[in-house]
Interface confidence: medium
């Protein structure tokens, strides 16, 4: 339904508060280095312009597309060339090329200072002094660091952020009330950002068909009582929402997400019995709740899949007439019966089925050819099951920190060319799969673990894409979205790697390590571990363990010393010498 003025349409649909917040997110995700004040100024100008269009949709420029309006506004930034370099060339292009150009310059790892949390009293004072600016600053800081953050979901986080300050700044013990809430928001926010980044990578690198297949599988698991046509409807609408958000069309995305939540709640009887509570909540909470809702119970007495997809004489006919619909039905039927499988496993099974039909439907006796297709699924199912079993046993044996270290060593040996900070970040996140998923019963372990690993490995892929250094990473990241994890799992030690030159400076530590949080101290030690492996890729587990134990003892000893700095200098030299001897460096 065409509107005379798109900007007026979205302003009226979303309301001024959400409109301003979403425009701020959009601008901060595009121009990640711009100061907060500059973005606020641009947002206010756009908002005032939108209001004139609401008053008169025929007013000058009101008929322009949102990309044109927003792009024109971004291109007024005076320091564009100095701050962003070649990104300024985007402004010489016309829409839609200009927006595509801005999208290509989004930086997953912007060179921005780490967000340091001020004292609670300082934060509460800032919150009370100017609540609106305080919350805008939150949106800005998150959006510029996470340029693909799901914008309507960021509004939900901001609402929770505001609620935390409203409650806790009045509490007797402000810190005890506020800090755990902020920690929870930070951790959930990082997870939400990474999950959305995978959705955008799926759409942008592998296309709409890949995203739709993922969505069919996931929604069929979640809504197993819904008809195939209903699932297809939801998939179509969900794909539109995520395509818009990943493409920077945040106003349309938020608007369409609200429409989708409304549709789901109006039709919950034909979708899922688990939606009732979600649908009673306000809009932002409702959308979030629907996205996280538990799987509905599977319908009783579902017939065997073999009848329609293997035994039927019409398999090749049905496939030939509408390949994607038939494969969609197969994926739907398989997924609704298997909430215990990961989405990526279900997609591998569907791909195997498709490949078999492509081959067999051209054969002399198609039925004979595809009759055993389900037997081909067995090894595909067993591979992740076995991997998860082994790694959960290892996690239970080692605990999270040491499990992360085992993965650090494993992945550094596989892809030693990758930067140390990336290896540390990715391996730490891979290691979190243990505490996140191993506690679950068997039936929930695989969807938890393998789909989480897909999200983490995508982080590796997007960070590596910025500065590619390893052909092996590029290969695993680009060949197949659903086979990324098996591809990385199958990598052995990189025999072509030339060990890094030993640099004593890398292993020189100072007294400041003693004041770090436990997490930061772990990261320092894990950074050293990665560097050790890069110097000595053939080092055994035992050798590495010995050196790391010595290192931990050294840090503990010097942090207890009266003259910490002297201890670190003197004992550090001894540790480096001992480590070199132990590893034969």
């Amino acid at each position: 339904d065409a509107h005379k003025s798109e900007v007026a349409h979205r302003f009226k649909d979303l309301g001024e508060e959400n409109f301003k917040a979403l425009v701020l997110i959009a601008f901060a995700q595009y121009l990640q280095q711009c100061p907060f004040e500059d973005h606020v100024k641009l947002v206010n100008e756009v908002t005032e312009f939108a209001k004139t269009c609401v008053a008169d949709e025929s007013a000058e420029n009101c008929d322009k597309s949102l990309h044109t309006l927003f792009g024109d506004k971004l291109c007024t930034v005076a320091t564009l060339r100095e701050t962003y370099g070649e990104m300024a060339d985007c402004c010489a292009k016309q829409e839609p090329e200009r927006n595509e150009c801005f999208l290509q310059h989004k930086d997953d790892n912007p060179n921005l200072p780490r967000l340091v949390r001020p004292e609670v009293d300082v934060m509460c004072t800032a919150f009370h002094d100017n609540e609106e600016t305080f919350l805008k600053k939150y949106l800005y800081e998150i959006a510029r660091r996470h340029p693909y953050f799901y914008a309507p979901e960021l509004l939900f986080f901001a609402k929770r952020y505001k609620a935390a300050f409203t409650e806790c700044c009045q509490a007797a013990d402000k810190a005890a009330c506020l800090l755990p809430k902020l920690d929870e928001l930070r951790d959930e926010g990082k997870a939400s950002s990474a999950k959305q980044r995978l959705k955008c990578a799926s759409l942008q690198k592998f296309g709409e068909r890949a995203f739709k297949a993922w969505a069919v599988a996931r929604l069929s698991q979640r809504f197993p009582k819904a008809e195939f046509a209903e699932v297809s409807k939801l998939v179509t609408d969900l794909t539109k929402v995520h395509t818009e958000c990943c493409h920077g069309d945040l106003l349309e995305c938020a608007d369409d997400r609200a429409d989708l939540a409304k549709y789901i709640c109006e039709n919950q009887d034909s979708i899922s019995s688990k939606l009732k509570e979600c649908c009673e909540k306000p809009l932002l909470e409702k959308s979030h709740c629907i996205a996280e809702v538990e799987n509905d119970e599977m319908p009783a007495d579902l017939p065997s899949l073999a009848a329609d997809f293997v035994e039927s004489k019409d398999v090749c006919k049905n496939y030939a007439e509408a390949k994607d619909v038939f494969l969609g039905m197969f994926l739907y039927e398989y997924a609704r019966r298997h909430p215990d499988y990961s989405v990526v496993l279900l997609l591998r099974l569907a791909k195997t089925y498709e490949t078999t039909l492509e081959k067999c439907c051209a054969a002399a006796d198609p039925h004979e050819c595809y009759a055993k297709v389900f037997d081909e699924f067995k090894p595909l199912v067993e591979e992740p099951q076995n991997l998860i079993k082994q790694n959960c046993e290892l996690f239970e044996q080692l605990g999270e920190y040491k499990f992360q270290n085992a993965l650090l060593v494993r992945y550094t040996k596989k892809v030693p060319q990758v930067s140390t900070p990336t290896l540390v970040e990715v391996s730490r996140n891979l290691g979190k799969v243990g505490s996140k998923c191993c506690k679950h019963p068997e039936a929930k372990r695989m969807p938890c673990a393998e789909d989480y690993l897909s999200v983490v490995l995508n982080q590796l892929c997007v960070l590596h894409e910025k500065t590619p250094v390893s052909d092996r990473v590029t290969k695993c990241c680009t060949e197949s979205l659903v086979n990324r994890r098996p591809c990385f799992s199958a990598l052995e030690v990189d025999e072509t790697y030339v060990p890094k030159e030993f640099n004593a400076e890398t292993f020189t530590f100072h007294a400041d390590i003693c004041t770090l949080s436990e997490k930061e101290r772990q990261i320092k030690k894990q950074t050293a571990l990665v560097e050790l492996v890069k110097h000595k890729p053939k080092a055994t587990k035992e050798q590495l363990k010995a050196v790391m134990d010595d290192f931990a003892a050294f840090v503990e000893k010097c942090c207890k010393a009266d003259d910490k700095e002297t201890c670190f200098a003197e004992e550090g030299k001894k540790l480096v010498a001992a480590s070199q001897a132990a590893l034969g460096l």
Epitope: E227, F228, K233, T236
Partner: nanobody, 119 residues
């Protein structure tokens, strides 16, 4: 009792157009996905197009994509199929049906309307 009544078939020249209608009763039409299927003389059933209860999304068999358009009017409990650029191979009896709840089986059928494309 579920009833589906197709109409609009006839004889048309290649390149011509026809609009089929299907009047539905006896079930809640606006919560049911619907489809058109066809059966050419001496051939098996071939599905043509599916439409969701809300009107989107729609799906088409590769053989009719770009030429046929499925639509519905929930207020009139009616399903439509606009057929343009008709070809000889489109000659068939066209049936409207209630979309299968999950498996490749169709719940309810009409009696069909014959479309003949010949010069």
């Amino acid at each position: 009792e579920v009833q589906l009544l197709e109409s609009g078939g006839g004889v048309v020249q290649p390149g011509g157009s026809l609009r089929l209608s299907c009047a539905a009763s006896g079930f809640t039409f606006d919560t049911s996905s619907m489809l058109w299927v066809r059966q050419a003389p001496g051939k098996g059933l071939e599905w043509v197009s599916v439409i969701h209860q809300s009107g989107t999304p729609t799906y088409y068999a590769d053989s009719v994509k770009g030429r046929f358009t499925i639509s519905r009017d929930n207020s009139k409990n009616t399903l439509y199929l606009q057929m343009n650029s008709l070809r000889a191979e489109d000659t068939a009896v066209y049936y409207c049906a209630k979309f299968p709840s999950s498996r490749m089986k169709f719940d309810y059928w009409g009696q069909g309307t014959l479309v003949t494309v010949k010069s």
